[in-house]
Interface confidence: low
């Protein structure tokens, strides 16, 4: 599914990631354009071997199994293909558990070099939330 | 349970392209990854990629690059498999498996002969 | 790419002996290692995934051991149901690479 910006806040403001952690909402809608441009089955392979998943591009070396990286945590004990659905509950509620990790959302490098110290509050300007 | 249903045997003229197909049933076809894998007599199995069908994402082992293309259709629940350019050396049984790192499910295989 | 190299290449038993196939690895692939049987026009089926762990549905009489470069399948009691090839695969890397196969054959 290929989330559209407003109906993306609204389901991230719904699973409580308004202001989680201290992040307002425009921080994590910022990070899922620029980490899958709001595709829940976005894939990408990294050179260490593990691939990110889904809307929030989460990281199988550490967060999620999917059987095929070598030396995988799976922190959020959670199979890497929860991540691929149309349904975000299970990345939401591993994006929790990174951010509560100590580095904040900077665990996200596309948040990092593309929302951080940014206006992120327009990534939810003019929503109906 | 979980299925892969592979088409059927081919001859092809060296030259021609051929397209193989491997239905999947059983499982949410779009997220897990198909693996293709070639086995020829004396060559045991060779790994030729994936694709995860929900997102269209592929990869190919270098050695296949340019001959094989991936692609899936997620209405109906199959991948296929294009060889191009076909030579004797692409003679062989061509496997469809479901990828979790190792493949417990396996198609039946498509036999492709060129000559 | 990493290379698996199998051995014996052929090896001829009696049904009821026990066997050790070998696989070996040109670099270190922790424990990310599997065992295939295949029968004659048949695919490939797994037999154990992850050096030892076995799959549901096979005999207890096959297992595997090993770690980083040197992996070992056991088969305890041959039975006639058991001849055929077996390979091994690595998924500690892309591209994934199978072993050359050992086929097990009837003295």
């Known amino acids: 599914k290929v989330f559209g910006r407003c109906e993306l806040a609204a389901a991230m403001k719904r699973h409580g990631l308004d202001n989680y952690r201290g992040y307002s909402l425009g921080n994590w809608v910022c990070a899922a354009k620029f980490e899958s441009n709001f595709n829940t089955q976005a894939t990408n392979r990294n050179t260490d071997g593990s691939t990110d998943y889904g809307i929030l591009q989460i990281n199988s070396r550490w967060w999620c199994n999917d059987g095929r990286t070598p030396g995988s945590r799976n922190l959020c004990n959670i199979p890497c293909s929860a991540l691929l659905s149309s349904d975000i509950t299970a990345s939401v509620n591993c994006a929790k558990k990174i951010v509560s990790d100590g580095n904040g959302m900077n665990a996200w490098v596309a948040w990092r070099n593309r929302c951080k110290g940014t206006d992120v509050q327009a990534w939810i300007r003019g929503c109906r939330l | 349970q979980v299925q892969l249903q592979e088409s059927g045997a081919e001859v092809m003229k060296p030259g021609a392209s051929v397209k193989i197909s491997c239905k999947a049933t059983?499982?949410?076809?779009?997220?897990?990854?198909i693996e293709w894998v070639k086995q020829r007599p004396g060559h045991g199995l060779e790994w030729i990629g994936e694709?995860?069908?929900?997102?269209?994402?592929?990869y190919y082992n270098e050695k296949f690059k340019g001959k094989a293309t991936f692609t899936a259709d997620t209405s109906s629940n199959t991948a296929y498999m294009q060889l191009s350019s076909l030579t004797s050396e692409d003679s062989a049984v061509y496997y469809c498996?479901?990828?979790?790192?190792?493949?417990?499910?396996w198609g039946q295989g498509t036999t492709l002969t060129v000559s | 790419d990493i290379e698996l190299t199998q051995s014996p290449a052929t090896l001829s038993v009696t049904p009821g002996d026990s066997v050790s196939l070998s696989c070996r690895a040109s670099q270190s692939i922790s424990n990310n290692l599997h065992w295939y049987q295949q029968k004659s026009h048949e695919s490939p089926r797994l037999l154990i995934k992850?050096?030892?762990q076995s799959m549901s549905g096979i005999p207890s009489r096959f297992s595997g051991s090993g770690s980083g470069t040197d992996f070992t399948l056991s088969i305890n009691s041959v039975e006639t149901e058991d001849f055929g090839m077996y390979f091994c695969?690595?998924?500690?890397?892309?591209?994934?690479?199978f072993g050359g196969g050992t086929k097990l054959e009837i003295k």
């Open positions: 694709i995860l069908p929900g997102s269209g994402s592929t």
């Open positions: 498996a479901r990828g979790d790192g190792h493949y417990y499910y």
């Open positions: 992850y050096t030892s």
């Open positions: 695969q690595q998924s500690n890397s892309w591209p994934r690479t």
């Open positions: 059983g499982y949410t076809f779009t997220t897990y990854w």
